[in-house]
């Protein structure tokens, strides 16, 4: 069963996914897709990284964390009810059948009528829970069970990132962005550097 995350219509949703690079800058390709993780790749790919950079993304999907340190958690901007469903994070570790697959279920609730929103509400309200058990089903489907161990310092750091998410929003298209500018555009919603 998938680990469940919640967000309200109009919020940004946060889906956590992490790995530990073998060495700084020694990155592993990662893909995010809509739909449960298939045997290869990520179903309908919405974002991917290669060994160096984010080389493909679609509108509203981006990485807020430091993906160069293995934080490949997905942010979905301004969610609607149509964003509900299962998402796949796949860590494409080279070798023979080495991929790590995580299925995450996003539940979108209708927006509540509330006073002016606080900064905290940019992401799903609570820090997402994490599992520490490792699961291996017959179909190799794993939920968040295979995440690397995360220590309290990392959790604190990530919690700060969540709290400062509006600042991160403001920064993401500045010099600190990890989105980059595309070599070309397929259309207004898709941006990628070719993977060769």
């Amino acid at each position: 069963s998938e680990v469940e995350y919640r967000a309200e219509v109009g919020q940004n949703a946060y889906l956590p996914c992490f790995y530990t690079p073998a060495a700084p800058g020694n990155l592993v390709p990662v893909c995010w897709g809509k739909g449960a993780c298939p045997v290869f790749e990520c179903g309908n790919v919405v974002l991917r990284t290669d060994e160096r950079d984010v080389n493909y993304w679609t509108s509203r999907y981006w990485l807020n964390g430091d993906f160069r340190k293995g934080d490949v958690s997905l942010t979905i901007e301004n969610v609607t009810l149509a964003d509900s469903g299962i998402y796949c994070c796949r860590i494409q570790i080279p070798g023979i059948m080495n991929d790590e697959k995580f299925n995450l279920k996003l539940v979108i609730k209708p927006a509540k009528v509330t006073p002016a929103p606080t900064r905290q509400r940019d992401f799903t309200a609570a820090f997402p829970r994490m599992l520490t058990t490792r699961g291996h089903g017959p179909a190799e489907t794993q939920t968040l069970g295979s995440l690397p161990d995360i220590n309290l310092t990392q959790i604190s750091t990530l919690a700060n990132e969540l709290r400062d998410s509006r600042l991160a929003n403001d920064l993401r298209d500045s010099g600190a962005t990890i989105r980059g500018s595309s070599d070309y555009k397929d259309d207004d919603d898709k941006h990628h550097h070719h993977h060769h």
């Epitope: 045997v39 290869f40 790749e41 990520c42 089903g137």
Partner: antibody, heavy 122, light 107 residues
């Protein structure tokens, strides 16, 4: 037009080796996972192996991974299957097939070669 | 491994008939299912992918449905060229697995 053309099949003795090749054309080869699927005479289809775009990740039927190696050469638009320690039960037509592309979405073997027959017999 | 079970194993039908072949997965495979047609001495041909999407160039009399564990391939009005063997195949778990095949013969 997408074309996949296998070669390298033939008669080999048990314990022997063969290297199958698949020449691809009509599409950007490096944008797709590729696969080998086999079919023993009069039997159904059996997946053998898959390889990702650049060859860094491979996937095998468990019972074959110690004897078979899938590889690719994107510069030559070619896919390979090295088969060692061949057994009579490896006798089959071996097909090269194009699998999922770089942006996902289409999960099925959309294009197949004509197949090459491997016969393992003494 | 995920087992794929097709039924029936064989069936006889006439031109113009509506035919349904079913495929059951031993585990949830969501919609990662493909259907293939194979004629003697030929390579398989993709008919349907992602459980219900018609592959390029495939006539609209073919359709697929289902998700999770139960899937169907329907041929709305059999044509002479449709007599062949049909296979389902899952793309969800490793190893990729095929059904045992359904041989569609002329009555």
């Amino acid at each position: 037009e997408v074309q996949l053309v296998e070669s390298g099949g033939g008669l080999v003795q048990p314990g022997g080796s063969l290297r199958l090749s698949c020449a691809a054309s009509g599409f950007t080869f490096s944008d797709y996972y590729m696969a080998w699927v086999r079919q023993a005479p009069g039997k159904g289809l059996e997946w053998v192996a898959n390889i990702n775009y650049d060859g860094s990740s491979t996937y095998y039927l468990d019972s074959l991974k110690s004897r078979f190696t899938i590889s690719r050469d994107n510069a030559k638009n070619s896919l390979y299957l090295q088969m060692n320690s061949l057994r009579a039960e490896d006798t089959a037509v071996y097909y090269c097939a194009r699998d999922v592309g770089y942006y996902g979405g289409n999960y099925g073997f959309a294009y197949w070669g004509q197949g090459t027959l491997v016969t393992v017999s003494s | 491994d995920i087992q794929m079970t097709q039924s029936p194993s064989s069936l006889s039908a006439s031109v113009g008939d509506r035919v349904t072949i079913t495929c059951r997965a031993s585990d949830n495979i969501y919609s990662y299912l493909a259907w293939y047609q194979q004629k003697p001495g030929k390579a398989p041909k993709l008919l349907i992918y992602n459980a219900k999407t018609l592959a390029e160039g495939v006539p609209s009399r073919f359709s697929g449905s289902g998700s999770g564990t139960d899937f169907t391939l329907t041929i709305s009005s059999l044509q002479p060229e449709d007599f062949a063997t049909y296979y389902c195949q899952q793309h969800y778990g490793s190893p990729l697995t095929f059904g045992q095949g359904t041989k569609l013969e002329i009555k």
